[in-house]
């Protein structure tokens, strides 16, 4: 079996997680793609997905999660803005390919969000500021409900720093005039 690897991101509340998942261009360019969270003993939960068929570079936003699929370069960009401690957890990008099981894109993302003033740059941070001038619009994309049961058994144990995301959808509120410090992956 393929050994699943994780990439760890340690960020502070209010920052932006920005990761890139790459895929085989020719095979998956217009396939629907999704961002999932993996919780112990459960099937991965889809938090956001691209449209079907996926549109080139056009952002799809669900709450605080923004997906951008760059077809020509085989790249799915995932951003989670205004991070909260509760967002900590294990995430993955997948490609939906019905009737087959979703295809997982490596690596999985181990996100650890800690409390703290995000205006002070740390080891994984920078001082470039981002201004949200208007509340972003939300585009709801219809995501298939199925996920591979096999993925559950592959999930590594949670780290002690891990805090599960609540079952409620991740929502973005009160973003007007808030200063954020982005961390682009």
């Amino acid at each position: 079996a393929t050994k699943l690897t994780e990439e760890k991101y340690e960020l502070k509340e209010g920052q932006t997680l920005d990761v890139k998942c790459d895929y085989t261009l020719e095979k998956f360019a217009s396939s629907q793609k999704a961002w999932q969270i993996i919780r112990d003993g459960e099937m991965p939960k889809t938090l956001a997905c691209t449209e079907r068929p996926s549109k080139n570079s056009h952002p799809v936003q669900v709450g605080r999660i923004i997906l951008e699929d760059y077809h020509d370069h085989g790249l799915l960009r995932v951003r989670m803005v205004n991070l909260q401690v509760e967002d900590s957890g294990l995430y993955q990008c997948v490609i939906y390919q019905p009737p087959k099981e979703p295809h997982m894109l490596f690596d999985r993302i181990r996100l650890v969000v800690t409390k703290g003033f995000s205006g002070t740059p740390g080891s994984n941070e920078n001082s470039t500021q981002n201004v949200y001038k208007i509340p972003p619009t939300t585009t709801k994309a219809l995501c298939p409900l199925y996920t591979s049961p096999r993925t559950v058994t592959q999930a590594p144990p949670k780290s002690t720093a891990d805090v599960s995301t609540p079952d409620s959808e991740i929502n973005l509120t009160n973003v007007t005039d808030i200063i954020r410090v982005p961390v682009f992956n």
Epitope: E7, D18, K20, D22, K55, N56, S57, H58, P59, E68, Y70, D72, H73, G74, L75, R77, N126, T128, N130, V131, Y132, K133, I134, P135, P136, T137, P182, V183, F184, N185
Partner: antibody, heavy 117, light 107 residues
Framework: EVQLVESGGGLVQPGGSLRLSCAAS????????MSWVRQAPGKGLEWVAN????????YYVDSVKGRFTISRDNAKNSLYLQMNSLRAEDTAVYYC??????????WGQGTLVTVSS | DIQMTQSPSSVSASVGDRVTITCRAS??????LAWYQQKPGRAPKLLIY???RLQSGVPSRFSGSGSGTDFTLTISSLRPEDFATYYC?????????FGQGTKVEIK
Amino acid sequence: EVQLVESGGGLVQPGGSLRLSCAASGFTFSSYWMSWVRQAPGKGLEWVANIKQDGSEEYYVDSVKGRFTISRDNAKNSLYLQMNSLRAEDTAVYYCARDYGESFDYWGQGTLVTVSS
Amino acid sequence: DIQMTQSPSSVSASVGDRVTITCRASQGIRKWLAWYQQKPGRAPKLLIYAASRLQSGVPSRFSGSGSGTDFTLTISSLRPEDFATYYCLQAHGFPWTFGQGTKVEIK
């Protein structure tokens, strides 16, 4: 065919202001992050600023923060860079570029900004 | 910010030569590195993205490799139109940063 055409460059005195424009065509402008990248005479490339598809997020390099403002008008397929309190070290060719996830895939021809007294 | 160091700063070569340019990142950037070619008075042109993927329309004599901190651009057989300055760009850490450039000159 993707095209980016910059305009608005010129000679300006230190402390002065200038507004650069970039006219985009050949692609769905409103679907892409856009950037300004500059190159001082005989020097290398430096990313200056970028802006999200809907204009709701802006990012700047530290050296221009508080002085430059990036904006866009999706109805006009146009990108702008308002440059205030200009300094001699801002002298450069300014390029408009399309962000494509992990690279700048298309660039304009550039417009020269000279800050000198 | 992530610093990108290119070497050499210039290289003299002849048509038909194999030319190798390296770029080193001050910290790991996975595979998120692009290479550009720039000729005098012209805008940069994207050659390679994601460390090794060839941009559409770019000749196959250009190739890229590497991941983490060390990356290489190779021109397998130099052509007259390849004499130019080459830049690397990292897109892993924000802000995106360029290398200082490598000028490929005629020997």
